[in-house]
C-alpha cells in the first residue's frame, strides 16, 4: 500500500507564437482544479477506461480575473499535492491522465459551469521510494509542469511497496540480512526468503526467491566483485574486500542513469543521456512508442509503431536530444559566414552581415565594382567588403571624381618645395639634397650618394617626379 | 516576406522521372525543414515527405520507394523527384516550410500542375 | 498511420452564423499537435491554427480551435463571406504527417 503524490507546479502557456486567450475574464472569473487518474502498466487504454489505480481530484484554485489586454499568464493554482492512495503493490510501470479544469463563476443558472480545459497523458516508469520525478506537457498552446512520486505507507517498503516493517526484536539492530526500515530506523525489515545462497553483505531482494546486487558486485548470488576502471583512477579509500580503491561520492557514482544511460555530472547535479526509446531524468521511461508521444518542444515522432520498434524524433530546429528536450544554442554552430553576427531570435536565426556580404547566412560575397564606374580612368579594386578606385595620376577621391592636388601630401623630403605640374608634381630641393622627392643628402665634395644626379641637372635643380 | 516558388515541367511521360524544384526567397533554408505536399485534382491533401539541410529526410511510406528529396543550401533550393511515374501522380504539387514549432505548415508555395500523359 | 476523419463533408450555412467543423483521429494525438488549414479554389491551404488552439500569425479571432486526444473541433464565431472555403485538419506529431479529407463550407 501507498500513496501516489502530484505536485502540480505551473500551468500556462507554453512556448511558440501564438499565446493562448486566457481562460477567465473581467465577466467571466473562473477558478481551476485538477483531475488525475493513474492505470497500471503502459498498456493502450482509452481516455475513458476506468482509473485502475486511483484517481484525485484537487481543491479549487484561487479566482482569477484575467487583466483586459494581458496575454495569459500562469494560472494561479490550488494549494497542496494530489494524492492517490493504491491499496495493493505499487506497479513500477503506469499511465497517468491529468485534467485541467476550469469553474466558471459567472452568473450560471443552477451554480458553476465545468469545461475542460486541457488534458495530459502519459506513460511511465517509477519505483516508490524514489525521489519527485519532474516532468512538463503541453496540451495545445498550454503547458502544465508537474512532478509526481510514489512512495510507500507503513509498513509497506521497497520499489514496489512490497516489503513489510515490523518492530524491533531487539533494541540495537535488526536480525542478520535485514536492515532498518528507512525512515522508520526503530523497526526492521520483514524477512524475505531470497535466494539460496544470496551474500547477505551484497544482495537483496524484494520479491521472495530473487537476488539483487548492490552496486560494485554481480553474479546470481551477488558475490563478484565488479571490477571497474575506477582502480585505476582512485578517488577514495581502498575497500578491503576488493582491495580496489572505490571512488568518493559523485553525482554519476552508481550511474544514476537507467536502461544503458550514459550519465555526465553538471555544476549542480548529473545529466542522463539516454538511448533511444527511453526518456526521463533518469531515463527510467521505457516500453514507449510514438503513441506515447514522447517527441517534446513539436518534435515529430517517426517509427515506433510498437514497443518493439525504435522510435525517432525529428526535432524542430533549435532541439535535440533523443526526445528533442534539449534547446540548442544555434549560434554555437557558426552559422554565420563572412564574420556575420549570429542572433537566435527562438523561432528562426538571423545573420547580421558585415558590409560587403548578403545572404541569409552571409554567404554572397557582393561584388564591390559591379556598377561602380572609376571616373577619368581608374580602376576598380575589390577588397575587404567595398570597393575602391586606384585613380589614373593627377586624380584622387572615392570615385576618382576630384582633381588631385599632387602636393597635398608634402610629398618632398628635407624642406624641399613642391609645386604642380601638368604631368605630376616637381620637387625644388633644398641646397644639399636631390633625387625626385628630395630624398638623397648630396655629400660637401660634390659629388652625391646614390643615385648619381640625372645629367644635365645640378645638385639644387628642381627635379621632375615622373 | 518569405515566398515560395515551384518550378518544374507541367507534363511528363508514364513511367519517367517527374523533378520539381522550390525555390525560396527571404529565408535561409538551414533554418527550417521543407516539404512536398501534393493534391490531386478535386481531391484532398497528401503528404509526400520533408528535407532538412543536414540532410534528415521523411517520406510518406505510400510514396517512399520512388520519393527523393534534396537541397541545394547555396541556392536556397531544394527539390523533389518521383520515379515511375503514372496517371495517379497528377497533381497540384506544393512546397511547403514546416513551423519552428512543430511539423505544421505555415508558409506555403502556390503550386504547380503536373500531368502525366503520354 | 493516424487516420483524420472530418465532419460533415459540407457544411451550409448563411454569413453570421456560427460554423463548427469536427477532425476526429484514429489514435490519440499526442500534445495536441492538430493544425487547421482553409484552402480556395486555386489557391494554397493556408494555416489558421496549430497546437489544437493557437491561432496562426495574421488570422482572425473569429477562427478558434479546440479539443485533444482525438476529438478536435475548428469553429467560426460569425461567418464572412471569405471564410467559405474547404478546411482540412493535419496532425504532425506522428509520422506520416496526415490531413483529413476536407470540410466544404458553401454559402446556403
Known amino acids: 500500500a501507498g500513496v501516489f503524490e502530484l505536485q502540480i507546479h505551473s500551468f500556462g502557456p507554453g512556448p511558440g507564437p501564438g499565446a493562448p486567450r486566457s481562460p477567465c475574464s473581467a465577466r467571466l472569473p473562473c477558478r481551476l482544479f485538477f483531475r488525475v487518474c493513474l492505470k497500471p502498466g503502459l498498456s493502450e487504454e482509452a481516455a475513458e477506461s476506468p482509473c485502475a489505480l486511483g484517481a484525485a481530484l484537487s481543491a479549487r484554485g484561487p479566482v482569477y480575473t484575467e487583466q483586459p489586454g494581458a496575454p495569459a499568464p500562469d494560472l494561479p493554482l490550488p494549494d497542496g499535492l494530489l494524492q492517490v492512495p493504491f491499496r495493493d503493490a505499487w506497479p513500477g510501470t503506469f499511465s497517468f491522465i491529468i485534467e485541467t479544469w476550469r469553474e466558471e463563476l459567472g452568473d450560471q443558472i443552477g451554480g458553476p459551469a465545468w469545461s475542460l480545459l486541457a488534458r495530459v497523458a502519459g506513460r511511465r516508469r517509477l519505483a516508490a521510494g524514489g525521489p519527485w520525478a519532474r516532468d512538463i506537457q503541453r496540451a495545445g498552446a498550454w503547458e502544465l509542469r508537474f512532478s509526481y512520486r510514489a512512495r510507500c505507507e507503513p509498513p509497506a517498503v521497497g520499489t514496489a511497496c512490497t516489503r513489510l516493517c515490523r518492530p524491533r526484536s531487539a533494541p540495537s539492530r535488526c536480525g542478520p540480512g535485514l536492515r532498518p526500515c528507512a525512515p522508520l530506523e526503530d523497526e526492521c525489515e520483514a524477512p524475505l526468503v531470497c535466494r539460496a545462497g544470496c551474500s547477505p553483505e551484497h544482495g537483496f531482494c524484494e520479491q521472495p526467491g530473487e537476488c539483487r546486487c548492490l552496486e560494485g558486485w554481480t553474479g546470481p548470488l551477488c558475490t563478484v566483485p565488479v571490477s571497474t576502471s575506477s582502480c585505476l583512477s582512485p578517488r577514495g579509500p581502498s575497500s578491503a574486500t576488493t582491495g580496489c580503491l572505490v571512488p568518493g561520492p559523485g553525482p554519476c557514482d552508481g550511474n544514476p542513469c537507467a536502461n544503458g544511460g550514459s550519465c555526465s555530472e553538471t555544476p549542480r547535479s548529473f545529466e542522463c543521456t539516454c538511448p533511444r526509446g527511453f526518456y526521463g531524468l533518469r531515463c527510467e521511461v521505457s516500453g514507449v512508442t510514438c503513441a506515447d508521444g514522447p517527441c517534446f518542444n513539436g518534435g515529430l515522432c517517426v517509427g515506433g509503431a510498437d514497443p518493439d520498434s525504435a522510435y525517432i524524433c525529428h526535432c524542430p530546429p533549435g532541439f535535440q536530444g533523443s526526445n528533442c528536450e534539449k534547446r540548442v544554442d544555434r549560434c554555437s554552430l557558426q552559422p554565420c559566414r563572412n564574420g556575420g553576427l549570429c542572433l537566435d531570435l527562438g523561432h528562426a536565426l538571423r545573420c547580421r552581415c558585415r558590409a560587403g556580404f548578403a545572404g541569409p547566412r552571409c554567404e554572397h560575397d557582393l561584388d564591390d565594382c559591379a556598377g561602380r564606374a572609376c571616373a577619368n580612368g581608374g580602376t576598380c579594386v575589390e577588397g575587404g567588403g567595398a570597393h575602391r578606385c586606384s585613380c589614373a595620376l593627377g586624380f584622387g577621391g572615392r570615385d576618382c571624381r576630384e582633381r588631385a592636388d599632387p602636393c597635398a601630401a608634402r610629398p618632398c623630403a628635407h624642406g624641399g618645395r613642391c609645386y604642380a605640374h601638368f604631368s605630376g608634381l616637381v620637387c625644388a630641393c633644398a641646397p644639399g639634397y636631390m633625387g625626385a622627392r628630395c630624398e638623397f643628402p648630396v655629400h660637401p665634395d660634390g659629388a652625391s650618394a646614390l643615385p648619381a644626379a640625372p645629367p644635365g641637372l645640378r645638385p639644387g635643380d628642381p627635379q621632375r617626379y615622373l | 516576406q518569405v515566398q515560395l516558388q515551384e518550378s518544374g515541367p507541367g507534363l511528363v511521360k508514364p513511367s519517367e522521372t517527374l523533378s520539381l524544384t522550390c525555390t525560396v526567397s527571404?529565408?535561409?533554408?538551414?533554418?527550417?525543414?521543407w516539404s512536398w505536399i501534393r493534391q490531386p485534382p478535386g481531391k484532398g491533401l497528401e503528404w509526400i515527405g520533408y528535407?532538412?539541410?543536414?540532410?534528415?529526410?521523411n517520406y510518406n511510406p505510400s510514396l517512399k520507394s520512388r520519393v527523393t528529396m534534396s537541397v541545394d543550401t547555396s541556392k536556397n533550393q531544394f527539390s523533389l523527384k518521383l520515379s515511375s511515374v503514372t496517371a495517379a501522380d497528377t497533381a497540384v504539387y506544393f512546397c511547403?516550410?514546416?513551423?519552428?514549432?512543430?511539423?505544421?505548415?505555415?508558409?506555403w508555395g502556390q503550386g504547380t500542375m503536373v500531368t502525366f500523359s503520354s | 498511420e493516424i487516420v483524420l476523419t472530418q465532419s460533415p463533408g459540407t457544411l451550409s450555412l448563411s454569413p453570421g452564423e456560427r460554423a463548427t467543423l469536427s477532425c476526429r483521429a484514429s489514435?490519440?494525438?499526442?500534445?495536441?499537435?492538430l493544425a487547421w488549414y482553409q484552402q480556395k479554389p486555386g489557391q494554397a491551404p493556408r494555416l489558421l491554427i496549430y497546437g489544437a488552439s493557437s491561432r496562426a500569425t495574421g488570422i482572425p479571432d473569429r477562427f478558434s480551435g479546440s479539443g485533444s486526444g482525438t476529438e478536435f473541433t475548428l469553429t467560426i464565431s460569425r461567418l464572412e463571406p471569405e471564410d467559405f472555403a474547404v478546411y482540412y485538419c493535419q496532425q504532425y506529431g506522428w509520422s506520416p504527417i496526415t490531413f483529413g479529407q476536407g470540410t466544404r463550407l458553401e454559402i446556403k
Open positions: 528535407i532538412y539541410y543536414s540532410g534528415t529526410t
Open positions: 527571404n529565408v535561409s533554408i538551414s533554418s527550417y525543414y
Open positions: 489514435q490519440t494525438i499526442s500534445s495536441s499537435y
Open positions: 511547403a516550410r514546416l513551423s519552428n514549432w512543430g511539423f505544421a505548415f505555415d508558409i
